[in-house]
């Protein structure tokens, strides 16, 4: 058993049928000694008398919020959590499984630049009854400082039968220099707590290995004097580290016919224009990617022909 | 290929084709280790990550953006001195800082070339020839320093005595690349913002 | 493997123009981005043009931009290079290279291969 938070106690259980469970030692936070009852949650059945109560933890029936109480007043609350190991492995119930990049993905981590700042997001299909608290860090064995925001729910959406809820975090790391070069990964720990059920998520990774640079921004046509040519043009998002010359995106352009049949023209470039054949119903679109470490492409930045 | 490659315009910044050529070459490397040494621990989650040239060369610092000296985590500089001439210099003003930083880079590169070429004599001693540097990287090197042109001690190839530990010696090659993977990656930046300016 | 054979240089007054073309044998053309070149005496191979496999996407140095059209016919395997308003600056031998990494705008070192060239020549 340990210590969540103030008066939250998590109790670890090897979870298979017949297990022997836990034994759990509450004391009641009291300097009284006499006279002191026991009872779990809303039911009034008195579980035991004394500043101690010995329980046997084995089942979710045996978790809950167990009170301590003299004549009629409380005196201390202790709020018990269950944490599943099933097979020597934590159970995964709270959170789904994002499955990308790989297997058993439940956090998924991303920053538009190299300031340090990232967000993370996990989903789930439940609704109610349920609190995350997030913790992030560089390195584990001498951490360095990185503040994590509230978890607030981003987004909800049908799939299928079910609905699914999209939470997400901001994180910065409280000393960053946007030029170092990363030895030591960050570290994000996501608590979460579905009625009295305890579960924990870590991702670990390199700020330069979760960078998506924002869209390019004013993606702009220009007609060409006598000619069925337009010139493309557009600049780096706001949000991406600057001096640009430092940190250079490489852009990706494409010209798509109306049709999804018709063959997409698609090509590199360093620049931040080009010259493009803009037929009618077409349209043109461009991405960017950090040019020297090649992490995720944006999404695109997209204008039609016409 | 059909000619000999041409040479980089002569107005650009002469480093920056070399740099280019030696961040593709160390990321192609790369990959054919991950590919060729795929039983071993060799991809970036799995691998110490290790720094070869930490508390003898400090490139990131002396080669900082001038927009990025105002930020107070970025100047935890070490106080190292560098000899200052070097063609990529070549016939611009440059300031105290910007040759300390191109022979840093030199450094680094004379540091990992040793490095390099003491690994690769010990994988030739392998039976299971399964994996050598690519000289390609080797001469890309090469060609930087050369661009650099820093005058400089050679550093004698390290020779061990004992018996090569070939599984160590994958290791340690997976741990040299990712590392000069992200040091070529700070070169190119530098080299990048160095031609823009 | 591919081969590139440049033609339609020559002589020619400045304000005139000229067509350059490349033809390329094998078959795999249409996958890469071609790209033309030039040299004078003494100097580094300067970029001109490039355009991208489909022939729709392409840039240009900035002393051709609006003078010059880079196309491409991927039927005939064929790059060219419309060169108008041409200006005694422009003399140089003219070199269609073929790069598979779909970069427009890359050094010439990243093009793989490279024609022999072909001679403009523009008189004042």
């Known amino acids: 058993i340990w210590e969540l938070k103030k008066d939250v106690y998590v109790v670890e259980l090897d979870w298979y049928p017949d297990a022997p469970g836990e034994m759990v030692v509450l004391t009641c936070d009291t300097p009284e000694e006499d006279g002191i009852t026991w009872t779990l949650d809303q039911s009034s059945e008195v579980l035991g008398s004394g500043k101690t109560l010995t329980i046997q933890v084995k089942e979710f029936g045996d978790a809950g919020q167990y009170t301590c109480h003299k004549g009629g007043e409380v005196l201390s609350h202790s709020l018990l959590l269950l944490h599943k190991k099933e097979d020597g492995i934590w159970s995964t119930d709270i959170l789904k499984d994002q499955k990308e990049p790989k297997n058993k993905t439940f956090l998924r981590c991303e920053a538009k630049n190299y300031s340090g700042r990232f967000t993370c997001w996990w989903l789930t299909t439940i609704s109610t009854d349920l609190t995350f608290s997030v913790k992030s860090s560089r390195g584990s064995s001498d951490p360095q400082g990185v503040t994590c925001g509230a978890a607030t729910l981003s987004a909800e959406r049908v799939r299928g039968d079910n609905k699914e809820y999209e939470y997400s975090v901001e994180c910065q790391e409280d000393s960053a220099c946007p030029a170092a070069e990363e030895s030591l990964p960050i570290e994000v720990m996501v608590d979460a707590v579905h009625k009295l059920k305890y579960e924990n998520y870590t991702s670990s990774f390199f700020i330069r290995d979760i960078i998506k640079p924002d869209p390019p921004k004013n993606l702009q046509l220009k007609p060409l004097k006598n000619s069925r040519q337009v010139e493309v043009s557009w600049e780096y998002p706001d949000t991406w580290s600057t001096p640009h010359s430092y940190f250079s995106l490489t852009f990706c352009v494409q010209v798509q016919g109306k049709s999804k049949r018709e063959k997409k023209d698609r090509v590199f470039t360093d620049k931040t224009s080009a010259t493009v054949i803009c037929r009618k119903n077409a349209s043109i679109s461009v991405r960017a990617q950090d040019r020297y470490y090649s992490s995720s492409w944006s999404e695109w930045a997209s204008v039609p022909c016409s | 290929r059909n000619l000999p490659v041409a040479t980089p315009d002569p107005g650009m910044f002469p480093c920056l084709h070399h740099s280019q050529n030696l961040l593709r070459a160390v990321s192609n490397m790369l990959q054919k280790a991950r590919q060729t040494l795929e039983f071993y621990p060799c991809t970036s989650e799995e691998i110490d990550h290790e720094d070869i040239t930490k508390d003898k060369t400090s490139t990131v610092e002396a080669c900082l953006p001038l927009e990025l000296t105002k930020n107070e985590s970025c100047l935890n500089s070490r106080e190292t001195s560098f000899i200052t001439n070097g063609s990529c210099l070549a016939s611009r003003k440059t300031s105290f800082m910007m040759a300390l930083c191109l022979s840093s880079i030199y450094e680094d590169l004379k540091m990992y070339q040793v490095e390099f070429k003491t690994m690769n004599a010990k994988l030739l001693m392998d039976p299971k020839r399964q994996i050598f540097l690519d000289q390609n990287m080797l001469a890309v090197i090469d060609e930087l320093m050369q661009a650099l042109n820093f005058n400089s001690e050679t550093v004698p190839q390290k020779s061990s005595l004992e018996e090569p530990d070939f599984y160590k010696t994958k290791i340690k090659l997976c741990i040299l690349l990712h590392a000069f993977r992200i040091r070529a990656v700070t070169i190119d930046r530098v080299m990048s913002y160095l031609n823009a300016s | 493997e591919v081969q590139l054979v440049e033609s339609g240089g020559g002589l020619v007054q400045a304000g005139g123009s000229l067509r350059l073309s490349c033809a390329a044998s094998?078959?795999?053309?249409?996958?890469?981005?071609m790209g033309w070149f030039r040299q004078t005496p003494g100097k580094g191979r300067e970029f001109v043009a490039a355009?991208?496999?489909?022939?729709?996407?392409?840039d240009y140095a900035n002393s051709v931009k609006g003078r010059f059209t880079i196309s491409r016919d991927n039927a005939k395997n064929t790059a060219y290079l419309q060169m108008n308003n041409l200006k005694p600056e422009d003399t140089a031998v003219y070199y269609c290279a073929a790069n598979r990494e779909n970069f427009l705008n890359r050094g010439a070192g990243d093009y793989e291969y490279w024609g022999q060239g072909t001679q403009v020549t523009v008189s004042s």
């Open positions: 355009i991208s496999t489909g022939g729709q996407i392409s």
């Open positions: 094998g078959r795999t053309f249409s996958a890469y981005v």
